[in-house]
Interface confidence: low
């Protein structure tokens, strides 16, 4: 009956971690004697090719300085300890500890048997490194030029992580890759870039990092922070301001980052009705008169700049009962 070597075509191990390279001689054959088990790296320089050996009487040996005896062990193989115990070499699984990038490559497990001769199997060891991911917003001020508003960094991955962004904004990503501090690893940085405006402030975008060491992609939310001048609108005008009306108010509605530092009410005509009193973001009208036939301007400032809005007021002689309640902007 023929015997064969059962190995995995590919094994993945974490950089710095421990990996097992399975190797079994199958099936169990009565009378088959295993005289030696060896692990070799056929692609390595000559003095590094013989990685490990297990002799039925002498036990394990690790002739190559790389990986070396301090990082190698046989998981299950047992040597004969006397006349009463047989060596157990059918399972030649090899463990590598403290994986390095240099450990990546082909490994050949070979059984020297009597009377069947030598049989072997080959495994490709891939060394991967699980990256550390982080994402953060960059505090930016509005401008007309595309600016990096968020960074997503996948640090020291092997192979390099794939970074993408999930967002409804109009954006583009700029990616750079540099060698990690751990040999053989790559740090990937993706810059989420857009023309920063108030529309982007406070919006949460998501950095998606994919890597074969993850069961699922890592999703990292980032809340954008864009400093922008006030975006102003005026509310409160209902197209039904009439002479003598006393309950009228205009409100200056603002979106800004940072918060407004000042509000200023004025008119385009330069004349400001005495019965209109500015109270911060509100303009309270005690009594509407003909001077209110004008355009009111609210100017708002913050640390970035200023914004303004205008509201044209039409003063009626008498209340408009038909269209009352319609709002104007």
């Amino acid at each position: 009956q023929d015997v064969r070597v059962q190995v995995l075509p590919e094994v993945r191990g974490q950089l710095g971690g421990t990996v097992e390279l399975p190797c079994h001689l199958l099936p169990p054959v009565p009378g088959l004697y295993i005289s030696l088990v060896t692990w070799q790296r056929p692609d390595a320089p000559a003095n590094h090719q013989n990685v490990a050996a297990f002799h039925p009487k002498m036990g394990p040996s690790f002739p190559s300085p790389k990986p070396g005896s301090e990082r190698l062990s046989f998981v299950s193989a047992k040597q004969s300890t006397g006349q009463d115990t047989e060596a157990e070499l059918q399972d030649a699984t090899l463990a590598l500890h403290g994986l390095t990038v240099e450990d990546e490559g082909n490994y050949t497990c070979e059984f020297a048997t009597f009377p069947k001769g030598s049989v072997r199997g080959m495994t490709w060891l891939r060394v991967i490194a699980k990256p550390k991911n982080q994402a953060e917003a960059q505090k930016v001020t509005f401008s007309q030029d595309p600016t990096t508003v968020a960074l997503c960094i996948s640090k020291e991955g092997r192979p390099p992580a794939r970074i993408s962004w999930l967002s409804s904004l109009d954006w583009e990503a700029k990616e750079t890759q540099v060698s990690g501090t751990l040999a053989g690893t790559v740090t990937v940085t993706s810059r989420f870039t857009l023309v920063p405006s108030g529309r982007a402030d406070g919006v949460t975008v998501t950095c998606k990092v994919e890597h074969e060491s993850f069961e699922e992609p890592a999703l990292i939310p980032v809340t954008l922070s864009v400093r922008y001048p006030p975006e102003v609108s005026i509310s409160g005008y209902d197209d039904n301001w009439y002479l003598g009306r006393t309950d009228a108010t205009l409100s200056c509605d603002v979106r800004s980052n940072p918060e407004p530092t000042g509000y200023d009410w004025s008119t385009t005509s330069g004349t400001f009705p005495t019965s209109a009193v500015a109270q911060g973001s509100q303009l309270v009208i005690h009594a509407v008169d003909s001077l209110f036939n004008t355009t009111f301007v609210c100017t708002v400032t913050n640390a970035v700049g200023m914004g303004r809005a205008e509201q044209v007021i039409f003063v009626r002689e008498t209340p408009n009962t038909a269209g009352a309640g319609a709002t104007g902007g």
Partner: antibody, heavy 116, light 111 residues
Amino acid sequence: AQSLEESGGRLVTPGTPLTLTCTASGFTLSSYHMSWVRQAPGKGLEWIGIISSGGSIYYASWAKGRFTISRTSTTVDLKMTSPTTEDTATYFCARYAAYSIGMDLWGPGTLVTVSS
Amino acid sequence: QFVLTQPASVQVNLGQMVSLTCTADTLSRSYASWYQQKPGQAPVLLIYRDTSRPSGVPDRFSGSTSGNTATLTISGAQAGDEADYYCATDDNSGSSYQYVFGGGTQLTVTG
């Protein structure tokens, strides 16, 4: 100054649901990942769970089913679904500054005593 | 979920250097953090991302990692450093997320 404060800790009987609330001042709570951590008298710190700024919630394996974390725009809540005497501890809420950095701001803690 | 092991207590003479260790049972590819907690107070973040110090933390506190061990070093211990110290790390593998604290080390400053 930025600060966190927990509230809702009190003496409860076993099995009585209890909700703890974490309130922030000086920063926008909704922009941060927030964690709950507890410490039994004379014992070490024990992580309960975290809620991300996007609303994703993760629990310690031992805490699943025993606690529920939720948030509004201004608070983060920890509901103890059916407390036992082993849940007697000081409960802290903590701000998780950014992904994989650490908890850079902690509340003073609120004491929950579960006793019959 | 991995386990972080810290010595239960460590003593140091005033002004001397002391190192507190934190060993993971499996090699962590995540960052270590260190927290200081004084009696009756909330913990305070001392070290993040293995080696970084938040503003306000004295530079006598430093962090390092080697293999699966994180170390907090206090270069010249002061009486005010007497406290419990906790290491912590996170595991973001797959769909789960866990944050793990070590059991804590009680530091006593003598002299």
